[in-house]
């Protein structure tokens, strides 16, 4: 018996071939001997089966001795043995229809779980193997689960269902809702404008939700809500904003905030959360601000940084085009009685300059 695998919702074509290459009488029946369709001369006739409105054939092939049964919009319950009667012969074809669906939505938040459920006909024992967009393979039976979805899991999942040495392939598009970056750090000199950008890693036709930026300044004992906003059809509208600092927020995506100036009291880290409509959980992005200040007070030249710096960062003071006078893995360095000239304060990571501030020391007479 020939076995054909089909996909729920798809169309399948079961073949039936006569030895004579001409149009002769044929009938397709199901395992209960109920007629599905056949011919009367050059006319297609249909029987009382449940497939009535979804069954068809290709009249153009009859003259060649081919009498296919086409079943549209396949259902799991269409799984059956179909019999083609032609020239006093019976050709049997076993059709097995499978369906593979994502448990909930195909748009899932980063960190959530994806469950794929296989619908299969009674008596079948299929195996399923899925390949994620990042090349990870998962195997299972009726259900497959992936916990802690990552950004790289966004895209087309290819799942192969194997039954009776035959296979059928499913493609499921999964969108992982997340920010492009989990964390970012901005380095600024005191007084400079600060830009925070929160690009999303996905695009959807209509995006609605609400968000908030909480800020923990290094100098403050507790965190503070800097801004709350709504998102409707990708348009951002500010609901409430703190008066210090006076933030500005763009009304178009990607989410974008500006701080009029970087000040030591703003240095610290923030957490932007975005709750999307009809989704449980929130999207998060951490943002950090490091602020540098170089000052000269009497005979003391000082360079300081505020904010979340890693212990391996180096802070140094050097006279332009000369060796560093002082270089430490600390948040403040100073030089007593500095020579006249242009001094540079540098914050660097393994030789790469992250932040630079220049200060001119005038000669003392």
């Amino acid at each position: 018996k020939k076995v054909v695998l089909g996909k729920k919702g798809d169309t399948v074509e079961l073949t039936c071939t006569a030895s004579q290459k001409k149009s002769i009488q044929f009938h397709w029946k199901n395992s209960n001997q109920i007629k599905i369709l056949g011919n009367q001369g050059s006319f297609l006739t249909k029987g009382p089966s449940k497939l009535n409105d979804r069954a068809d054939s290709r009249r153009s092939l009859w003259d060649q001795g081919n009498f296919p049964l086409i079943i549209k919009n396949l259902k799991i319950e269409d799984s059956d043995t179909y019999i083609c009667e032609v020239e006093d012969q019976k050709e049997e074809v076993q059709l097995l229809v499978f369906g593979l669906t994502a448990n909930s939505d195909t748009h899932l938040l980063q960190g959530q779980s994806l469950t794929l459920t296989l619908e299969s006909p009674p008596g079948s024992s299929p195996s399923v193997q899925c390949r994620s967009p990042r090349g990870k393979n998962i195997q299972g039976g009726k259900t497959l689960s992936v916990s802690q979805l990552e950004l790289q899991d966004s895209g087309t999942w290819t799942c192969t269902v194997l039954q009776n040495q035959k296979k059928v392939e499913f493609k499921i598009d999964i969108v992982v809702l997340a920010f492009q970056k989990a964390s970012s750090i901005v380095y600024k000199k005191e007084g400079e404008q600060v830009e925070f950008s929160f690009p999303l890693a996905f695009t959807v036709e209509k995006l609605t939700g609400s968000g908030e930026l909480w800020w923990q300044a290094e100098r403050a004992s507790s965190s503070k809500s800097w801004i709350t906003f709504d998102l409707k059809n990708k348009e951002v509208s500010v609901k409430r904003v703190t008066q210090d600092p006076k933030l500005q927020m763009g009304k178009k995506l990607p989410l974008h905030l500006t701080l009029p100036q970087a000040l030591p009291q703003y240095a610290g880290s923030g957490n932007l959360t975005l709750a999307l409509e009809a989704k449980t959980g929130k999207l998060h992005q951490e943002v950090n601000l490091v602020v540098m200040r170089a000052t000269q007070l009497q005979k003391n030249l000082t360079c300081e940084v505020w904010g979340p710096t890693s212990p391996k960062l180096m802070l140094s003071l050097k006279l332009e085009n000369k060796e560093a006078k002082v270089s430490k893995r600390e948040k403040a360095v100073w030089v007593l009685n500095p020579e006249a000239g242009m001094w540079q304060c540098l914050l660097s990571d393994s030789g790469q300059v992250l932040l630079e501030s220049n200060i001119k020391v005038l000669p003392t007479w």
Epitope: D230, K232, H256
Partner: antibody, heavy 119, light 107 residues
Framework: EVQLLESGGGLVQPGGSLRLSCAAS????????MSWVRQAPGKGLEWVSG????????YYADSVKGRFIISRDISKNTLYLEMNSLRAEDTAVYYC????????????WGQGTLVTVSS | AIQMTQSPSSLSASVGDRVTITCRAS??????LGWYQQKPGKAPKLLIY???SLQSGVPSRFSGSGSGTDFTLTISSLQPEDFATYYC?????????FGQGTKLEIK
């Protein structure tokens, strides 16, 4: 073809009220952001007020906040500007303007209607 | 509100000249800026949107550049019909704000 036609301008005394209308056609009015922009005689352009297409939120320039109200009637494809407590400095040509689909500038403008506030 | 500072306020030039008008924002506004041309007694006309995109139907001699706080409108070769007043507009967020305008006159 997109068309914006303002009406309702005229002479009004200081402290008085006036309602401007802007009849829109040729685009999906209900989903488009719209604004009012004015120009005092011999002066530059000043953005006055806007209404969001997606959520109907309304926005105002500080100079008119609390005195002007922007609104729209989707069934009539009409944008309105209710102007109260009018002052001499509100004298201007008022334009209604349609924003591009993704809020990148005003791609269509009406011909303008003149509002004169004088005793 | 975000302030827009446009310069120069007036400019004299001849047909065929290359002309540059600048606009500076008090805050970073990404590329959310448009340039408009206005002729006496007429409504403004959009030339450039999103800082550098040419509006449909606008001659290619008009170009825009810039991002963040500093923006430029350039007319590569002035034509007689280009003598008008030009405005920049920030549409980064509400309230929108225009620059003071630049009047381009024939020398």
């Amino acid at each position: 073809e997109v068309q914006l036609l303002e009406s309702g301008g005229g002479l009004v005394q200081p402290g008085g009220s006036l309602r401007l209308s802007c009849a829109a056609s040729g685009f999906t009015f209900s989903t488009n952001a719209m604004s009012w922009v004015r120009q005092a005689p011999g002066k530059g352009l000043e953005w006055v007020s806007g209404i969001s297409g997606s959520n109907g939120n309304t926005y105002y320039a500080d100079s008119v906040k609390g005195r002007f109200i922007i609104s729209r009637d989707i069934s009539k494809n009409t944008l309105y500007l209710e102007m109260n407590s009018l002052r001499a400095e509100d004298t201007a040509v008022y334009y209604c303007a349609k924003e591009r689909d993704n809020w990148n500038g005003f791609d269509y403008w009406g011909q303008g209607t003149l509002v004169t506030v004088s005793s | 509100a975000i302030q827009m500072t446009q310069s120069p306020s007036s400019l004299s030039a001849s047909v065929g000249d290359r002309v540059t008008i600048t606009c500076r924002a008090s805050h970073v506004i990404r590329n959310d800026l448009g340039w408009y041309q206005q002729k006496p007694g007429k409504a403004p006309k959009l030339l450039i949107y999103a800082a550098s995109s040419l509006q449909s139907g606008v001659p290619s001699r008009f170009s825009g550049s810039g991002s963040g706080t500093d923006f430029t409108l350039t007319i590569s070769s002035l034509q007689p019909e280009d003598f008008a007043t030009y405005y920049c507009l920030q549409d980064y967020n509400y309230p929108y704000t225009f620059g003071q305008g630049t009047k381009l006159e024939i020398k």
